[in-house]
């Protein structure tokens, strides 16, 4: 499940930095996957916001629940918060088992 | 039903390692749904949770940063127990200390209790 | 650290009557919040998880509400058995942080 979820990710990924005009010298932060779900580009000072991967909200159907960030800074992306396994109740290792 | 039953010394000296061990009937250590965590109360600090241990597919641990350098949370699978091992304790780690199990349901919460252990630092 | 503080640090209230506990968090924690009762010389006992929601076993009396930083854990019809000391929790970000105790007593 996560190898397709990967896959998918790298196309919407570009699919983003063409829409963004966005190439590997621009400022700002990637658009990545972190091993459990993607991050979209984002410019210095915009926050990130995902849901726990659908794989896991039947955890956690609570919508304003399940919510992860993330902020682009100049020094690239911050740390998630809440962290996934607090927020999601799982851990990143389990995503990759 | 799941259960927690605690031991250890009730004292320690000062700059020795205070050792407690959770005892898990109804439930394993290895739990993939579960954490094992330690708590202390103290009149001074209230309740604080210190850190915990996890399985995974590997074992996990998260620490307090307060305690972070002296504290180190091990499973025994083979005894299904954790315990709680705190390096140099000073007459401030004086407190209750308690084991808890933690679950999962839209949020961690921990559901099972130790009975609790009063663990005194002195000379 | 998330900081959690809770009001009234004590209270007295009579067999019947119906109370409310304020617990308020340092930043916003959604609903990552749980609420514990604890009786001299025992552990602390699940009541309610995820701000609202009650644990198996415990009366329907009480309950749980709010979001974001302010919550209120309410009893309704306070029996004897409930005079003890509640404290709330964080769950969003480690260290996992108690809020510092409201005890009830009987008046």
């Known amino acids: 499940i996560f190898k397709k979820e990967q896959a998918m990710c790298l196309e919407k990924i570009q699919r983003a930095n063409e829409l963004m005009g966005f190439n590997d010298s621009s400022p700002g932060c990637p658009g990545m996957w972190d091993n459990i779900t993607c991050w979209k580009p984002a410019h210095v000072g915009e926050m990130v916001l995902v849901s726990c991967p659908e794989l896991f909200r039947i955890f956690n159907p609570d919508q304003d629940m399940g919510v992860v960030s993330r902020n682009c800074t100049e020094d690239g992306w911050s740390e998630p918060f809440p962290h996934y396994f607090d927020a999601c109740g799982f851990d990143e290792y389990e995503s990759e088992t | 039903q799941v259960q927690l039953q605690q031991s250890g010394p009730g004292l320690v000296k000062p700059s020795q390692t205070l050792s407690l061990t959770c005892a898990i009937s109804g439930d394993s250590v290895s739990n993939k749904q579960a954490t094992w965590n330690w708590i202390r109360q103290s009149p001074s600090r209230g309740l604080e949770w210190l850190g915990r241990t996890y399985y995974r597919g590997k074992w996990k641990n998260h620490y307090a940063v307060s305690v972070k350098s002296r504290i180190t949370i091990n499973p025994d699978t083979s005894k299904s127990q954790f315990s709680l091992q705190l390096n140099s304790v000073t007459p401030e780690d004086t407190a209750v200390y308690y084991c808890a199990r933690g679950m999962w349901n839209q949020n961690w919460f921990l559901d099972h209790w130790g009975q609790g252990t009063l663990v005194t630092v002195s000379s | 650290d998330i900081q959690m503080t809770q009001s009234p640090s004590s209270l007295s209230a009579s067999v019947g009557d119906r109370i409310t506990i304020t617990c308020r968090a340092s930043?916003?924690?959604?609903?990552?919040l749980n609420w514990y009762q604890q009786k001299p010389g025992k552990a602390p006992k699940l009541l309610i998880y995820?701000?609202?929601n009650l644990q198996s076993g415990i009366p329907s009396r009480f309950s749980g509400s709010g979001s974001g930083t302010d919550f209120t854990l309410t009893i309704n019809s306070l029996q004897p058995e409930d005079f003890a000391t509640y404290f709330c929790?964080?769950?969003?970000?480690?260290?996992?942080?108690f809020g510092p105790g409201t005890k009830v007593d009987i008046k």
């Open positions: 930043q916003y924690i959604v609903r990552y």
């Open positions: 995820g701000a609202r």
């Open positions: 929790q964080q769950s969003i970000q480690t260290p996992y942080t």
